[in-house]
Structures are given as C-alpha cells and as structure tokens.
C-alpha cells in the first residue's frame, strides 16, 4: 500500500491521543534505554509503511502484536485516514485470524515495540533545522 | 548486535581500481541512509559519498565525483563503494557509517564500522 | 563550500571542564554532531541534533549551538577522554557531509 495520500494530521492527533498511551502502557516497566535502534523512516509515508510492517507483519519471536490495543487503533486510523487501505488489508486479517494464538509479550515483541515508539515519534516530529 | 564490517581494501598502484564492501546486521538496513567516510594517515575525517536510503539519490564529495561510485543492495544488507583512476592521495582508511535521514536532510552518523586500510602506491 | 573551524588542540585537568568550539557562517541554523574519535579506532558519536546525546554516552559529555559557534562542552575530564573529536554537518545547499578539521584533547 502506498501511504502518500494518507491524512498525515489526522493520523498524528489520534497517535497522540491514544496510540502513543497505548505504546507507552505495553512498554510499561522496560526503560526507554534498552533498546538501540534498529529501524528508522524518512519521511512520513516511509514511516507509515515501516510502522504497518513492523505492527502487522509476524516476525521470528514475537508472532503476537496484531491483536495489541495500540495495533488496532493503529489499524483503524490507517482504515479512516488512508484512502482505500482498509480494502488491501482483508486478505492480510483473515490470515491472521487464522494464525491467532495465545498472548506471549515476549523480550522480542518489546524489542518490537521499542522500534515502533521510534518510528511514531520519527513520523510526529517538527521540521528539521533548516539545512 | 548492530554492526557495519568493511572489507576489500589492500594495495594498489596509481590508476587502478578497488571495490570496498560493507556488511551491514543487527538493523534494518534498508531503513538507513549509508555514507563512507575515509581518514588519511594522520589527518582528519573526509567525507566521501552517501547514499539514500532506498538507493534513490547519491552525493559524492569534489574530490572523487567521476572516479568513484556508491552503490547498495538492500536485499543484502551491503553498501558497496566502487573507486577507478586511484591516486597516491586517496590511501586511507575508510569507514562505511549509517544515518537516518528526514527527506533530503542527512542526520548524525550513530554507526560506524572497524575501517579498512586503502594504499595507493607505486 | 562550507566549513567549519575547530581549534587543533584543547588541554583540560582532570576533573575540571573542557569546552571545544566548532565555528561556522550562521551553524546556529544547522544541526551539529560530535564524535569522539580515539587512536587506531573508529569515530564514535557523542552528541547529536547539538545537544543530545546517546544512551551510551556519559551525561558529562553536553553541547550547544547558537550564531556562529557550536560548542562540545565535557565535564570532569578524565584521562579517558583524551582523542579527537570532531564536529559535523549536512549542508543542504551543496548535498555535503561537512567535518571540521578536529580537535586533539589533552588530559593533562
């Protein structure tokens, strides 16, 4: 999906009013310092396609987050503010429904989450100093 | 563990050409500006070239434009820098380093790798 | 092109506080990043975005950009600290990394 038409504003106001709490409660008692980072975005389309994989995607260790509070209104703002993204997504959530397993927070889904914190604040950031 | 490991560099006459590498792990490269920097012996940082994170632009620094040629391979994991036509002034160590970048605008250089030795001489 | 000036060399005593300058026409406006470089090793980043700094890196390492001069200020100089650093830049009107020439700290 290509994230360019997306509502950019709309997408950060409902980030700050609950995503961002929701990211910040699954992280609770990790310090902000554990993890490196080891994912970035430069642009806020690039930051909105790395966050869908990231969220979305199973990967080896953390099989988990697409189920979380915070990815599944991270999914409905991507379905109300990205014009026809809820329509690339049902092939995506019927196979993850048939994946569905027992809520693990592993040390890796933290890992996980740590990444996307970064990549939220990366996306909700002022402009640069001009260069 | 996050890691950038150079390789490829060794001796080599006056005009001819040499291939860097730059085995990337532990990040997702592919989310990453990539710059090479090189130092000659006793002196300072040299920037040489970037490249975008997605491969889509490049920028080389005056003194290789031409000669030399930045390239990476995402679906690798590699920044590969391609130097021709070497000069005795180009010996030094290069460092291959990521950078996240904002748009067009290039941040801090959070990672660097070990270095690899590169002599020009005759 | 742009460049930036630093002092070759900067002596500091242990324990007191070192200050190494970066100049620049306007590098208030520019992000500036700093790396500690020592010898025989590659550069490492101390400071970022002119005054943020790594979770690795100690909270005596602390700098400031404003007008024409940025600054890498460190704190309780240890013998640790002796090494290069060196300030940078993106300059957005040529699409160049800018290092300054560097800077030798001296532990005394």
């Known amino acids: 999906y290509d994230f360019t038409n997306c509502d950019f504003e709309k997408i950060k106001a409902a980030y700050l009013s609950t995503i961002s709490k929701d990211l910040i409660t699954y992280m609770s008692g990790t310090k902000s310092t554990e993890f490196n980072n080891t994912v970035s975005c430069s642009n806020r389309p690039h930051c909105l396609t790395e966050i869908q994989s990231l969220t979305f995607n199973p990967t080896a260790g953390c099989a988990s987050l697409a189920k979380e509070m915070f990815a599944m209104k991270t999914k409905a703002a991507l379905a109300i503010w990205c014009p026809g993204y809820s329509e690339t997504q049902i092939n995506a959530t019927q196979a993850m429904k048939k994946r569905r397993k027992r809520k693990v927070t592993t040390n890796k889904c933290l890992e996980q989450v740590s990444q996307l914190q970064g990549l939220w604040r990366r996306f909700n950031r002022p402009l640069l100093k001009q260069q | 563990q996050m890691q950038l490991v150079e390789s490829g560099g060794g001796v080599v006459q006056p005009g001819r050409s040499l291939r860097l590498s730059c085995a990337a792990s532990?990040?997702?490269?592919?989310?990453?500006?990539m710059h090479w920097v090189r130092q000659a012996p006793g002196k300072g940082l040299e920037w040489v070239a970037v490249v975008w994170y997605d491969g889509s632009d490049i920028h080389y620094a005056d003194s290789v434009k031409g000669r030399f040629t930045i390239t990476r391979d995402n679906s690798k994991n590699t920044l590969n820098l391609q130097m021709n036509s070497l000069r005795a002034e180009d010996t030094a160590v290069y460092y291959c380093?990521?950078?996240?970048?904002?748009?067009?605008?290039?941040?801090?250089?959070?990672?660097w790798g070990q270095g690899t030795m590169v002599t020009v001489s005759s | 092109s742009y460049v930036l000036t630093q002092p070759p060399s900067v002596s500091v005593a242990p324990g007191q506080t070192a200050r190494i300058t970066c100049g620049g026409n306007?590098?208030?406006?520019?992000?500036v990043h700093w790396y500690q470089q020592k010898p025989g090793q590659a550069p490492v980043l101390v400071v970022y975005?002119?005054?943020d700094r790594p979770s690795w890196i100690p909270e005596r390492f602390s700098g400031s950009n404003s007008g024409n001069t940025a600054t890498l200020t460190i704190s309780r100089g240890e013998a640790g600290d002796e090494a290069d650093y060196y300030c940078?830049?993106?300059?957005?009107?040529?699409?160049?990394?800018?290092f300054g020439g560097g800077t030798k700290l001296t532990v005394l």
């Open positions: 306007n590098i208030g406006s520019k992000s």
């Open positions: 940078q830049i993106w300059d957005s009107s040529s699409d160049h990394v800018v």
């Open positions: 975005d002119d005054s």
């Open positions: 380093s990521r950078s996240p970048q904002w748009e067009d605008i290039f941040e801090s250089m959070d990672i």
């Open positions: 532990g990040f997702t490269f592919r989310t990453y500006g």
